[in-house]
């Protein structure tokens, strides 16, 4: 099943997707669509690139802010709303019959809440779960080690926080790790 990424209403969401151009500089078209990857192309295209640049974007909120020319085609959605929630398809359109790479990622947009977890717990959660999203320009939590995480305050709802703590506790227990 697709990996979940979480963003708060009003923040920027980051949906990772990348490929390695072979040879370097040999870019391929990419499309991002709202909805799971279909058989061909993308449905409900939100952004499309050709071999050189972004050539189709349905809204000014959709951006490729990574190094597009090195294959980082991660999608940033600015100022997300609840309506942005859902599955997105990143399709890397490698030439040839049925050669495309298809990646479904799920964006969960949550309402801002008042609970701020303690810094240590926050770092553990964001490093342990790809479902957690850092906001803005920092990219996905799973690409950063706990020591290098930016000092941003992620606010989460009580339910979400308890769910993550419960899941983290069980995963650590299953792995034999010590729970702090």
């Amino acid at each position: 099943s697709e990996v979940e990424y979480i963003a708060e209403v009003g923040q920027n969401a980051y949906l990772p997707c990348s490929y390695t151009p072979a040879p370097p500089g040999n870019l391929v078209p990419v499309c991002w669509g709202k909805g799971a990857c279909p058989v061909f192309d993308c449905s409900n295209v939100v952004l499309r690139t050709d071999n050189r640049d972004v050539n189709d974007r349905t809204s000014g909120r959709y951006w490729l802010k990574g190094d597009f020319h090195k294959g980082d085609v991660s999608l940033t959605i600015e100022n997300v709303t609840l309506a942005d929630s859902g599955v997105y398809c990143c399709r890397i359109q490698i030439p040839g019959i049925m050669n495309d790479e298809k990646h479904n990622v799920k964006l969960v947009v949550i309402k801002p809440a008042k609970v701020t977890p303690a810094p240590t717990l926050q770092r553990d959660l964001t490093s342990a779960f790809p479902r957690m999203l850092t906001t803005g320009e920092h990219g996905p939590a799973e690409t950063q080690t706990p020591g290098s995480l930016p000092d941003v305050n992620l606010t989460v709802s009580n339910f979400f926080c308890e769910l993550q703590i419960f899941t983290l506790t069980n995963e650590l227990r299953d792995s034999g790790a010590t729970i702090r």
Epitope: G35, A36, P38, V39, S43, P95, G96, I97, M98
Partner: antibody, heavy 116, light 107 residues
Framework: EVQLVESGGGLVQPGGSLRLSCAAS????????MTWVRQAPGKGLEWVAN????????YYVDSVKGRFTISRDNAKNSLYLQMNSLRAEDTAVYYC?????????WGQGTLVTVSS | EIVMTQSPATLSVSPGERATLSCRAR??????LAWYQQKPGQAPRLLIY???TRATGIPARFSGSGSGTEFTLTISSLQSEDFAVYYC?????????FGGGTKVEIK
Amino acid sequence: EVQLVESGGGLVQPGGSLRLSCAASGFTFSNSWMTWVRQAPGKGLEWVANIKQAGTEKYYVDSVKGRFTISRDNAKNSLYLQMNSLRAEDTAVYYCNSGSNYFDYWGQGTLVTVSS
Amino acid sequence: EIVMTQSPATLSVSPGERATLSCRARQNFYSNLAWYQQKPGQAPRLLIYGASTRATGIPARFSGSGSGTEFTLTISSLQSEDFAVYYCQQYNNWPLTFGGGTKVEIK
């Protein structure tokens, strides 16, 4: 207004060949995937083949692979289906569609009858 | 090949009544499903795509719902022009496949 007009259908003997054409207008043909769907008399719909915008990728249902060839001429806004080694089970109305996954525009269809 | 099962095969409904058509599959299609209407002697017409999005010009009495393996097309109040055959079509897996159709007839 989008228009898709198929032609080239008719009666052909088993083992024979036909070339269907579809003339497109009212949309940017060169930016669109194009598809053939068929419907045997009194039966349901069956996807047959489709082709990417530049013609670089073509896909076929297994039952027609090696016998049918889809092609396009973007300069003429035209889609084609070359049908060889025709069989009785290829008898159907053939529809030309714009779209890759689902089909928002359809032609009126052209009837292909394979019979001796 | 993915088999799409539509039920019922025939649905007898009176004008003004509600019609509910079902389309089922054995695997997850997310929302990659479309519905078409076909009247005798005519080409099919796209009604719904993405399981629930109405195509351009389609009246609000047509609605689609469901995701995964079970999908529904609902016609809230049948008009005389709605009596036709309805097909679902999945576009999540190759090859693209259609259901066998549901004929909606006048009761």
